[in-house]
């Protein structure tokens, strides 16, 4: 069993290359059955995964993927060169950085090789499908006796990202959140020195370079202040 699992933090398990095997055509025509929808995400503009639900097929089928870009030097139809698998059946295609052109319409075509007329074509705006890596290197420093500043880094062009900061104290039932623009810093003007604070951040490719809806994973949390876990029942749940 070859399975590829690609997660939005850049960690990658085993990979497999695809060998096309055509299966005998079933006597019952499946040309009218809809093909699964392809979902594409561009991870930090380093690679792109286009995946589909292979289990929606009535029988195991190695669907094939072709793609092209409109109005560009890259408008020739390309075959997927690196398929992703689920239980030995094609379930996606991975494109590398050199094959990604964010600002040209990406046209992706899924086909049943046993039924060549059974194919579906989608048009995607890749700049709206970028998911950045989670923010890194969160640091806190005091601007004054009661004011904290949170800083972080992103492994991408900073001006392309917006951010969401969440923080809470040991005593809070829920997170407080604050949107932050491309400047990737956040100030908390009034800090209670008797409380322990936890901060975390996530980022999105929006609005200057694209209109992505999906956020990155949350950063690792960073803490500040007194550790009052013995007195407060909420802290354990927060860190669990």
């Amino acid at each position: 069993l070859n399975t590829t699992i690609l997660t939005p933090n850049g960690n990658e398990d085993t990979t497999a290359d695809f060998f096309l095997t055509t299966m005998p055509t079933d006597s019952l025509s499946v040309s009218t059955l809809p093909l699964p929808e392809v979902q594409c995400f561009v991870f930090n503009v380093e690679y792109m995964n286009c995946t589909w639900n292979s289990s929606s097929e009535p029988q195991p089928t190695n669907l094939t993927l072709h793609y092209w870009y409109k109005n560009s030097d890259n408008d020739k139809v390309q075959k997927c060169s690196h398929y992703l698998f689920s239980e030995e059946i094609t379930s996606g295609c991975q494109l590398q950085k050199k094959e990604i052109h964010l600002y040209q319409t990406f046209v992706v075509q899924l086909q049943d090789p046993r039924e060549p007329r059974r194919q579906a074509t989608q048009m995607l705006k890749l700049q709206n499908l970028v998911i950045p890596w989670a923010p890194e290197n969160l640091t806190l420093h005091k601007l004054s006796e009661s004011q904290l500043e949170l800083n972080w880094n992103n492994r991408f062009l900073n001006h392309c990202l917006e951010h969401l900061v969440q923080y809470r104290t040991d005593w809070d039932h829920s997170w407080t959140e604050q949107s932050v623009d491309y400047r990737h810093k956040f100030s908390l003007p009034s800090v209670d020195g008797q409380k322990r604070y936890t901060f975390r951040v996530r980022s999105r490719f929006n609005p200057l370079c694209g209109s992505a809806q999906h956020w990155s994973e949350w950063s690792h949390p960073i803490h500040w202040g007194s550790n009052t876990s013995k007195e407060n029942p909420f802290l354990f749940a927060l860190e669990a």
Epitope: H66, N71, D75, V107, Q119, T121, M123, L124, N128
Partner: antibody
Amino acid sequence: LQESGPGLVAPSQSLSITCTVSGFSLTSYGVHWVRQPPGKGLEWLGVIWAGGSTNYNSALMSRLNINRDNSKSQIFLKMNSLQTDDTAIYYCAREGSTVDSMDYWGQGTTVT
Amino acid sequence: DIVMTQSHKFMSTSVGDSITITCKASQDVTTAVAWYQQKPGQSPKLLIYWASTRHTGVPDRFTGSGSGTDYTLTISSVQAEDLALYYCQQHYITPWTFGGGTKLEI
């Protein structure tokens, strides 16, 4: 884009329509077919993309075929087993290069 | 197949008014929505694609917007020549599908 068709087709017979284009290359632009029954809305029939691959309306797929002759700048629509509810104006329309939809349409040919 | 629904078959307006035509997709079409105008006896003409991009030569009184499953075409300061049928169409995934059309009456 200029469509030309037979005008009248007997029930159960086949329909062949030609779309002749000028001012652009079929290897750079896709061409779609759309029809409009009298007094009704638009129905997408299919497309032949710039690269030569095709997609069809799922309900009509078994009866439709689209191909082209690049050297003559012509696209052909063939539909089998016509019935009275296939009576419509048949349009061909260009898929824009920077426009991700049908940016220019022929004047249509009426098929009864 | 994705179903595009234009809930109003007819809409009535007066010259100079603003009017909004709506279209709902049966699933998220990621802003891949076009709008066409068809005047009596003519072929359809493209107005808007990718939900909000105006086609070349289209007057700026035509504005498209929307995301997910809900899309609108707004005509501000309607002119007499805007009397027509308006169709939405999804260009996200084949088979491409049209709404049933909305007839604008002045």
